[in-house]
């Protein structure tokens, strides 16, 4: 799925109302120093196509994340507020029924979180080039992280 | 519990540099950006910049592009913001601080390192 | 660069009482709005982010509202330890912007 047509400032506003805080609560009791981010994304539409993957993709050692209240919460913002995007994950959902039942949250599964927020953070605020063109809103789809 | 600890008072002259340093502990550091902000004596807030420690973007305000260059040191986690080609209106209280867990505020700030610029 | 305009630049409140700052920005911020308060001889402290969202800690008697380019500040009760500088930011676009400070003193 393109997330370039995507309602940004709608989903930050629901990532900022609820979602956020459901992340919180899922990471709670870990150390904030325990976990590196090495997942980055450069734009918003880029921070969304590996928030998805993240969130709605079973790994290894983690195959339960869908099922969290942050990750139905982000299903129902996108299919909102990105056009078409409810019509792609017909597949994805069957596939995610036949992921295992039970919510089990493993150090894998925080690790996953970890980043999460990370991406999250970034969408939120992406880190654009200088400023004439830096308008969170509209053009940060159109550039790229500016390397001193 | 997160802190940010920056250096010393410098005292500059007129066209030389300083680089002020900002110590990070209680949370990865390479997971949060550090903004740079200054203060004039009895003025406002004023925003210089922002590096990302992770990978070492960076954005700067266009009043100081040129003259300010921010890095950071993973492996000591700590930030640093130089300035350059020093003047008696660069006389101020540095501050770094820790973008907030959702990335739209500053959250835990330094406690300021004076910079006095003077012949 | 997005002006961010503060009002008063200082008011003087009667311990109890309510207080409102009014920022408004020179162009739409949509709700990338934040709110710190420096109290005298220290860092400035996050208090309000994202318009209306408390940070933690930070009591109740902090609102704040708004959206697009007019937002506020209120204090349903001010207290002793409010006194200081209240600055609002916007975080919407680069370079980031503070206004110029509204200064808080108790009666």
């Known amino acids: 799925y393109d997330f370039t047509n995507c309602d940004f400032e709608k989903i930050k506003a629901a990532y900022l109302s609820t979602i956020s805080k459901d992340l919180i609560t899922y990471m709670s009791g870990t150390k904030s120093t325990e976990f590196n981010n090495t997942v980055s994304c450069s734009n918003r539409p880029h921070c969304l196509t590996e928030i998805q993957s993240l969130t709605f993709n079973p790994t290894a050692g983690c195959a339960s994340l869908a099922k969290e209240m942050f990750a139905m919460k982000t299903k129902a913002a996108l299919a909102i507020w990105c056009p078409g995007y409810s019509e792609t994950q017909i597949n994805a959902t069957q596939a995610m029924k036949k992921a295992r039942k039970s919510k089990v949250t493993t150090n894998k599964c925080l690790e996953q979180v970890s980043q999460l927020q990370g991406l999250w953070r970034r969408f939120n605020r992406p880190l654009l080039k200088q400023q004439g063109s830096s308008d969170y809103k509209d053009d940060d789809d159109k550039h790229h992280h500016h390397h001193h | 519990e997160v802190q940010l600890v920056q250096s010393g008072a410098e005292v500059k002259k007129p066209g030389s540099s300083v680089k002020v340093s900002c110590k990070a502990s209680g949370y990865a550091f390479s997971n949060y950006l550090i903004e740079w902000v200054r203060q004039a004596p009895g003025q406002g807030l004023e925003w210089i910049g922002v590096i990302d420690p992770g990978n070492g973007d960076t954005n700067y305000n266009e009043n100081f592009k040129g003259r300010a260059t921010l890095t950071a040191d993973k492996s000591t986690s700590t930030a640093y913001m130089e300035l350059s080609s020093l003047r008696s209106e660069d006389t101020a209280v540095y501050y770094c601080a820790r973008e907030d867990n959702t990335g739209t505020a500053f959250d835990y700030w330094g406690q300021g390192t004076t910079v006095t610029v003077s012949s | 660069s997005i002006v961010m305009t503060q009002t008063p630049l200082s008011l003087s409140v009667t311990p109890g009482q309510p207080a409102s700052i009014s920022c408004k920005a020179s162009?739409?911020?949509?709700?990338?709005v934040t709110w710190y308060l420096q109290k005298p001889g220290q860092s400035p402290q996050l208090l309000i982010y994202?318009?209306?969202n408390h940070y933690t800690g930070v009591p109740d008697r902090f609102s704040g509202s708004g959206s697009g380019t007019d937002f506020t500040l209120k204090i349903s009760r001010v207290e002793a330890e409010d006194v200081g500088v209240y600055y609002c930011?916007?975080?919407?676009?680069?370079?980031?912007?503070f206004g110029q400070g509204t200064k808080l003193e108790i009666k």
């Open positions: 994202y318009v209306s």
């Open positions: 162009q739409s911020v949509s709700s990338d």
């Open positions: 930011q916007q975080h919407h676009r680069f370079p980031l912007t």
